[in-house]
């Protein structure tokens, strides 16, 4: 069964191509209510009435998933838990189409990076998606940020069109994904 969320698309617009955020400085673990204040509005089909969507308000729909671009800063682990609070997971990129969609969204925020659901325990162990599935570098390459001072960047974020490894403790924004079934 598919949950249908009804929302007024009039408020689900982008301003100057940037995601709106009323809570950019909330660095603490968000509550359910504060999460709703710290996410980007949906880039929805522009209709004046009420539309039916398989996604909750403020989530963006693309193909068979809903996406939420969170504008609260958190570690990778904190971001993962924030997505869980909303019944979702950190982004898992399954296809080049999906990657293109995500790049288009985050490229409108060139100053920001977004955690995705890829991590590893340490450099000797392969990258793993949050759901336990294997990572294939056929889809994208992960550009390393490792230095002698920071030798263990074991989480992954996307910045504009490039995907980097990064220290998991660095506060960043994040992308939650909720798959739906018709």
């Amino acid at each position: 069964t598919m949950a249908i969320w009804r929302s007024n698309s009039g408020s689900n617009t982008l301003e100057n191509g940037y995601f709106l955020s009323r809570n950019k400085e909330n660095h603490s673990q968000p509550t359910q209510s504060s999460l709703e204040d710290s996410v980007t509005p949906t880039k929805a089909v522009k209709t004046t009435g009420v539309l039916s969507s398989p996604c909750p308000p403020n989530w963006i729909i693309y193909e068979k998933s809903c996406y939420l671009f969170s504008m609260s800063l958190n570690s990778w682990d904190g971001s993962k838990r924030q997505c869980w609070q909303l019944g979702s997971n950190l982004l898992k990129i399954d296809s080049s189409n999906e990657l293109g969609f995500i790049v288009k969204q985050v490229s409108s925020q060139p100053d920001n990076s977004f955690w995705i659901g890829l991590s590893r325990p340490q450099t000797e162990v392969p990258w793993l998606w949050e759901d336990g599935s294997t990572f294939s570098s056929n889809l994208f390459q992960i550009r390393t940020t490792a230095t002698q001072e920071n030798p263990s960047p074991n989480c992954v974020w996307i910045h504009v069109s490039v995907i980097y490894d990064q220290l998991c403790s660095v506060p960043s924004y994040s992308i939650c994904e909720k798959k739906f079934s018709m």
């Epitope: 682990d77 325990p121 340490q122 000797e124 162990v125 392969p126 793993l128 949050e130 759901d131 336990g132 599935s133 294997t134 294939s136």
Partner: antibody
């Protein structure tokens, strides 16, 4: 639903080889590592290694290096674990398990008892 | 290899009891730890992954905590079906290793 079904019990002589199969269903076989874990009678769990069903890449515990071979046949969603030069202390239940979050083992086969006896 | 130790090795308890099992890694493993329950003649069952995340379908009376080298599995109110052996497993480095197990039996 996710299911892993293993081949039946085997009795082998010391020095022989055994090949255990693990047929997966209910998910995309190539998306998740398959691990092999064994348990000797009355003992704890011992990780033997894994195979990436997509690439065929393997990672074996040092203890089994040179004696174990993990393979897969993606056309029938089946993973295999072959252990050679069997000894009596290889007598154990051999499990396949599908990888889950944080490299945990979320789904397990029913186990295959391999008895090594002369 | 990372050695995993568990304590106690066995514990006798009654239905309704709160039971705590500890697991210690010989070196830091961050949160890359899982807990399993195994009953005689059965395959292990995943309870907790990532040190504290409850596997889908597992009752909420099970909880995990800890990070680094010291971890805990807690059963808040033991039920008859919880009498079993519990194992921890580290997934921080190869080879992945398990603790020796803790047997929870009826007092």
């Amino acid at each position: 639903q996710v299911q892993l079904v293993q081949s039946g019990a085997e009795v082998k002589k010391p020095g022989a080889s055994v090949k255990v199969s693990c047929k997966a269903s209910g998910y995309t076989f190539t998306d998740y590592y398959i691990h092999w874990v064994r348990q000797a009678p009355g003992q704890g769990l011992e990780w033997m290694g894994w195979i990436n069903p997509n690439s065929g890449d393997t990672n074996y515990a040092q203890k089994f290096q040179g004696r174990v071979t993990m393979t897969r046949d993606t056309s029938i969603s089946t993973a295999y674990m072959e252990l050679s030069r069997l000894r009596s202390d290889d007598t154990a239940v051999y499990y396949c398990a599908r990888n889950s979050g944080s490299y945990s083992f979320g789904y397990w086969g029913q186990g295959t008892l391999v008895t090594v006896s002369s | 290899d990372i050695q995993m130790t568990q304590s106690p090795s066995s514990v006798s308890a009654s239905v309704g009891d709160r039971v705590t099992i500890t697991c210690r890694a010989s070196q830091g493993i961050s949160s890359w730890l899982a807990w399993y329950q195994q009953k005689p003649g059965k395959a292990p069952k995943l309870l907790i992954f990532g040190a504290s995340s409850l596997q889908s379908g597992v009752p909420s009376r099970f909880s995990g905590s800890g990070s680094g080298t010291d971890f805990t599995l807690t059963v808040s109110s033991l039920q008859p079906e919880d009498f079993a052996t519990y194992y921890c497993q580290q997934a921080y480095s190869f080879p992945f290793t398990f603790g020796p197990g803790t047997k929870v039996d009826i007092e």
